[in-house]
Interface confidence: low
Amino acid sequence: IVLRPSRVHNSEENTMRALTLKDILNGTFSYKTFFPNWISGQEYLHQSADNNIVLYNIETGQSYTILSNRTMKSVNASNYGLSPDRQFVYLESDYSKLWRYSYTATYYIYDLSNGEFVRGNELPRPIQYLCWSPVGSKLAYVYQNNIYLKQRPGDPPFQITFNGRENKIFNGIPDWVYEEEMLATKYALWWSPNGKFLAYAEFNDTDIPVIAYSYYGDEQYPRTINIPYPKAGAKNPVVRIFIIDTTYPAYVGPQEVPVPAMIASSDYYFSWLTWVTDERVCLQWLKRVQNVSVLSICDFREDWQTWDCPKTQEHIEESRTGWAGGFFVSTPVFSYDAISYYKIFSDKDGYKHIHYIKDTVENAIQITSGKWEAINIFRVTQDSLFYSSNEFEEYPGRRNIYRISIGSYPPSKKCVTCHLRKERCQYYTASFSDYAKYYALVCYGPGIPISTLHDGRTDQEIKILEENKELENALKNIQLPKEEIKKLEVDEITLWYKMILPPQFDRSKKYPLLIQVYGGPCSQSVRSVFAVNWISYLASKEGMVIALVDGRGTAFQGDKLLYAVYRKLGVYEVEDQITAVRKFIEMGFIDEKRIAIWGWSYGGYVSSLALASGTGLFKCGIAVAPVSSWEYYASVYTERFMGLPTKDDNLEHYKNSTVMARAEYFRNVDYLLIHGTADDNVHFQNSAQIAKALVNAQVDFQAMWYSDQNHGLSGLSTNHLYTHMTHFLKQCFSLSD
């Protein structure tokens, strides 16, 4: 059981108060983290509270302002980037969000040597992406879907691509589906380590069907938003990878990197690019049927000025029980010999572990092993490998940082974080300086988050970067709910759950239960992290018990659990939520007449199917922006888990797993359906079809739409949403307002 800071600091019961919905909507109890912006082995930049950009040198203990808040304010800058030669800073303003990662902005270049903005050959606006070379101060940027290069900020630009066209050809930036489901970035260009070459992707969306939806705005006529968006089974983007020599860009122009023959024989994806040296690059490709991935190491041929990808440097990763990788196929971390690498993939027992590949995948040396999973490789140096895993004390929802000494024989393993602040900190990430001379640890909980700086050689803590003292003080008089993380063993399946209990929880009493579900493939909801959010309020003030359950399909507990849902979405995820509810009822403190379920996105899909399961367990439930049929969702994501919606593949389950097919079963539950009309991700179409099916079945339900809101339902919509859902649940549970 994890006891959250509650009455620890103050025993006087009457000075304590419950959380309010207003606390949550105002972000009163939000926390801060500190991620250094490393610029060398021992220096980092940080934006101070008063918006100065400050350079810190760990070894001298000195700090100085490299850019004043006055300069930042002069162009309304909200972000910055220092050139590696430290001569220039780009300042970013006029931020305009596009999709999850992408945005456009205006960029100004500030010359630190003379304290003035660079005049002449200014950058066009708005720019879709801009970055410095890793060495010096070359600039690459994307404007109107074309890539441009500047040797120096004041120079005229060299145009690298010319075929860029809105919604048709994307150079150096991903299209919608690659951004959301494959790269998870706003960029698709990569500098070589010393800035000699620039690699970039070209996405051709010419043949992709377009999703169109109305954006109502304030005008007399709504605008139509058009996005090339391949749904399951539709035509996909065609991707090509090019590399250009940035020293002499006009000499031979961009050179295409060949696709491995076994990949090119049918539809495929590019999944990531990793530079090894200035003249060696590693590309990862994936078949459209996403159980085969190929890692291809390519070398620059000086004589031909081309890139050669020999078959002997192709490494195949294949899954026979599911899809390749976890959520994404893992990326390699190369060692100092510039040919061997470390990579996370499934071992023979079906657990994701670190392997060392020197020649072939078949001869890979397994570095970690056990009935737990390695999750991320942070850094490989000459003598150490730093990674995170959930090994410690067998809690899958924890993350600790480990160091393996690869310089000594046999290699030894040390947990860097396990015993640092054991009660407070069980879920870490890390950020390393060059050569791992120093690193920052960011602890997310279960106690109040804290960020610390450490020596990369000794692991000694140097200083606290952020400890959220104000938050700690603010929480002293708050009755926070109790949280416990435990597991259920059902039919050889382990179901981990997090239960959030009212502050004065009494096992002899009966409480309404709310299940919060996400449940998507390779997700994890039961994590040892700190949060004061809507469900904290529901437990603290409204006396509800809230439970989160990680069922089949969820991550970091081995392939058996993960791949159980392969080609069968919407079955086991729902079953496992229902099984857990039955187990919770058996615990004796749940009022079985007052059980609800809610979820967002994939969670909205699962909550809808659970409500329509015909079990009679749920009195009511909420689906926010749910998927309703996998035929409506993005090809890259959907087909990874479901295959194709064709008769000779998996069409039957596509049809059987829709929410609409279960419309009749909503008759005996109270259902609240919510969606943003401008959702570019899970299209409003999904909820429109649920509503239509319910109307056609003459089933009563409640609904709320949010005009011009996307999948995140942000801004004032957030307040309206949570207020509305609170009223719905309180009414369902017969709680007075």
Epitope: D207, P209, G233, A234, K235, S266, D267, E631, L644, P645, T646, K647, D648, D649, L651
Partner: nanobody
Framework: EVQLVESGGGLVQPGGSLRLSCAAS????????MGWFRQAPGKGRELVAA????????YYPDSVEGRFTISRDNAKRMVYLQMNSLRAEDTAVYYC???????????????????????WGQGTQVTVSS
């Protein structure tokens, strides 16, 4: 339920014309290449026309090129085969087929294509005879 229903077959004199229609239901019509195959008595199925999804690229084998025209109407979920200058060797059962779209049309080799096609209709008889 997936259905492909052909119509428009019949008896026609050499040199004459026929227009075959195929009504599709039960799947996402726009995502599929559509094809017309034929099978003469004692022979294998052969592809006579194909039209891709989205970009309507057409394909014909040399034996029908210039005489047959395939078209589709995505809104009506229909695919058509206009057959002109018919010959006795065009006599066969004509099948409408839906093929999960790759960038190429269905394989010209009917037997190979049979394995990769999504759906088949029941067929309509075309007889060219004087």
């Amino acid at each position: 339920e997936v259905q492909l229903v052909e119509s428009g077959g019949g008896l026609v004199q050499p040199g004459g014309s026929l227009r075959l229609s195929c009504a599709a239901s039960g799947f996402i019509f726009g995502y599929y290449s559509m094809g017309w195959f034929r099978q003469a008595p004692g022979k294998g199925r052969e592809l006579v026309a194909a039209i891709s999804s989205f970009d309507d690229i057409t394909y014909y084998p040399d034996s029908v090129e210039g005489r047959f025209t395939i078209s589709r109407d995505n809104a009506k979920r229909m695919v058509y085969l206009q057959m002109n200058s018919l010959r006795a060797e065009d006599t066969a059962v004509y099948y409408c087929a839906a093929h999960y779209n790759r960038y190429a049309p269905p394989a010209a080799d009917g037997n190979t294509a049979l394995g990769t096609l999504g759906y088949w209709g029941q067929g309509t008889q075309v007889t060219v005879s004087s």
